[in-house]
């Protein structure tokens, strides 16, 4: 069967949202009323992958526009960025490791770790309106924690 | 053998609250997400709420986004509905379901608790 | 949202009957389709889930096929256990909806 994707938002566990920042950079920050409508809506693709009851391999496309997390070397460091694509070809269910993340529930928290660079994750900073960028550390400063919230196509 | 038991139904006035709960056993209910499907008289079931196994995840269909929450103590084996702002659209039977972890089908059902919304 | 249409919404048949549903669904949800049986004031339960695989412990007198927009439950040899109701639901893309219900009566 093709790759499924179900329409979701992203909050930190700081509830801050996130938002586009430029055409090719994410950042959170709090919003409330109206304003939840600036929140970056994800397309999650179920994908292949190494998985477990509590990871699960997924890729996190942005709703209707040709572009997905994505996780590269830059300056010899792990990076994420947003990439575009080919809408002809993705999502689809073999996305290249780069693309990819092992969405991982721990408690009531979810953290999103790079399949590339094993233990880096989607993180944020304590600080608002900066960045989503990929950490290494986990418990320190930066936050990797986030939660869900599925939305109707 | 896997058991899903509703409790909390009963008669509410519309604008009033109601929290429904429901006790699992005979599964490890941490390592699964969980959903509330509700069915009102002579209507197609409709799904209403959805938690991941840790409730870090969610979902509510826009009929009730803003009015229901869903929450879950995986120490108690117990999932929760909590209900506000009821409408007497809202008068079905509420019945708790187990799902697998990536939100397809719900494999388990519990009997059902009725709720009435009515003055 | 994926609407979903059942046929009939009822049909009476005999024990020993061969009785198929269709269920049609308004975008293609490929083999994301599941079947659940309801007897009266009872819980639905699981019979079929991506389109054509039986749930444990269900008979293999039924049996689901199809893909895309068109799927069908059928059974083969109609039992007494299996007046009911039967109702399709997709989980393709969200909100997962239900088919209105087939009610199998006996004849």
């Known amino acids: 069967a093709p790759v499924r994707s179900l329409n979701c938002t992203l909050r930190d566990s700081q509830q801050k949202s996130l938002v586009m920042s430029g055409p090719y950079e994410l950042k959170a920050l709090h919003l409330q009323g109206q304003d939840m409508e600036q929140q970056v809506v994800f397309s999650m693709s179920f994908v292949q992958g190494e998985e477990s009851n509590d990871k699960i391999p997924v890729a996190l496309g942005l709703k209707e526009k040709n572009l997905y997390l994505s996780c590269v070397l830059k300056d010899d460091k792990p990076t994420l960025q947003l990439e575009s694509v080919d809408p002809k070809n993705y999502p689809k269910k073999k996305m290249e490791k780069r693309f990819v993340f092992n969405k991982i529930e721990i408690n009531n928290k979810l953290e999103f770790e790079s399949a590339q660079f094993p233990n880096w994750y989607i993180s944020t900073s304590q600080a608002e309106n900066m960045p989503v960028f990929l950490g290494g550390t986990k418990g320190g400063q930066d936050i990797t924690d986030f939660t869900m919230q599925f939305v109707s196509s | 053998e896997v058991q899903l038991v509703e409790s909390g139904g009963g008669l509410v006035q519309p604008g009033g609250s109601l929290r429904l709960s429901c006790a699992a056993s005979?599964?490890?209910?941490?390592?699964?997400?969980m959903s509330w499907v509700r069915q009102a008289p002579g209507k197609r079931l409709e799904w209403v709420a959805y938690?991941?196994?840790?409730?870090?995840?969610?979902y509510f269909p826009d009929t009730v986004k803003g009015r229901f929450t869903i929450s879950r103590d995986n120490a108690k084996n117990t999932l929760y509905l909590q209900m506000n702002s009821l409408r007497a659209e809202d008068t079905a039977v509420y019945y708790c379901?187990?799902?697998?972890?990536?939100?397809?089908?719900?494999?388990?059902w519990g009997q059902g608790t009725l709720v009435t919304v009515s003055s | 949202d994926i609407q979903m249409t059942q046929s009939p919404s009822s049909l009476s048949a005999s024990v020993g009957d061969r009785v198929t549903i269709t269920c049609r669904t308004s975008?293609?949800?490929?083999?994301?389709l599941t079947w659940y049986q309801q007897k009266p004031g009872k819980a639905p339960q699981l019979l079929v889930y991506?389109?054509?695989t039986l749930a444990d412990g269900v008979p293999s007198r039924f049996s689901g096929s199809g893909s895309g927009t068109q799927f069908t439950l059928t059974i083969s040899s109609l039992q007494p256990e299996d007046f009911a109701n039967y109702y399709c639901?997709?989980?393709?893309?969200?909100?997962?909806?239900f088919g209105q219900g087939t009610k199998v009566e006996i004849k």
């Open positions: 938690i991941s196994s840790g409730g870090g995840s969610t």
């Open positions: 379901a187990r799902q697998n972890k990536k939100l397809t089908w719900f494999d388990y």
């Open positions: 005979g599964f490890d209910f941490s390592r699964y997400d």
């Open positions: 639901q997709h989980f393709w893309s969200l909100p997962f909806t």
């Open positions: 991506n389109a054509k």
């Open positions: 975008g293609n949800i490929h083999n994301y």
